[in-house]
């Protein structure tokens, strides 16, 4: 729970809000996909290494 939440919050860049992301992504499908990627990402570039 906490690790995923931290990863998710750190993923949003400084000026990003849910509204700005929704307005910038090109489809509803991509909006849904984007948050599938943010939640619990395994990519080191996105969330940093964890133990």
């Amino acid at each position: 729970g906490n690790l995923k939440h931290k990863c998710f919050r750190n993923s949003l860049e400084n000026n990003e809000t849910l509204e700005s992301i929704m307005n910038t992504l090109e489809s509803e499908e991509d909006f849904r996909k984007y948050f599938y990627y943010l939640e619990g990402s395994k990519d080191a570039l996105l969330c940093g290494f964890s133990t």
Epitope: S11, L12, E13, I21, T24, L25, E26, E29, D30, K33, Y34, Y36, Y37, L38, S41, K42, D43, A44, L45, L46
Partner: antibody
Amino acid sequence: EVQLQESGPGLVKPSQTLSLTCTVSGGSITNSYYASSWIRQPPGKGLEWMGVIIYDGSTYYSPSLKSRTSISRDTSKNQFSLQLSSVTPEDTAVYYCARGLRVAGSYFTDFGTWGQGTQVTVSS
Amino acid sequence: SYELTQSPSVSVALRQAAKITCGGDNIASKHAHWYQQKPGQSPVLVIYKDSNRPSGIPERFSGSNSGNTATLTVSGAQAEDEADYYCQVWDSSANAAVFGGGTHLTVLG
């Protein structure tokens, strides 16, 4: 709906440079949430990723093709292009442009949208 | 560089379950994606981020990723599922996408 369309010569002579263009409609190539790639498929073989360009013009290339590959963009036409130098018959393939989400700065995802592909034959 | 290994072909009886595997060193630490390609057509994304289906992809397609193997399962395979299937990951150390060699799924009967 975002659509991609490849264009370019179908026949290139050995040692020349292959040049292809992908026109994006329904979305912007300067949208920071997306990454635009070139992928090829030799006849009867599998998919090979060649490289990617992102919203600010930054590029990343396949290590095996890096020395011969260049990807650029024309924001005024909403197009991105591939140049592959010193081609040989082994570069004969269907060339696809594809687009995918780019998450949180530098993290690339899948290829959700593809062009229909363009056949390029390298022959004298 | 990172490599993904797929068996060249898999056969399945109509309406039975087909499993297509993709092997890679600790692939579970990466997001695996799967594409379907029918003859003369562009690839289509059928599974992303290990187990998620894009809109419009039938529920019979599912994915998993554990250890050194990612798996695409087609439950109740239909004749129209006969195609080539490719797995793909991003190799973040090389900033490069990597595809598996592809698996041809044959649906018998």
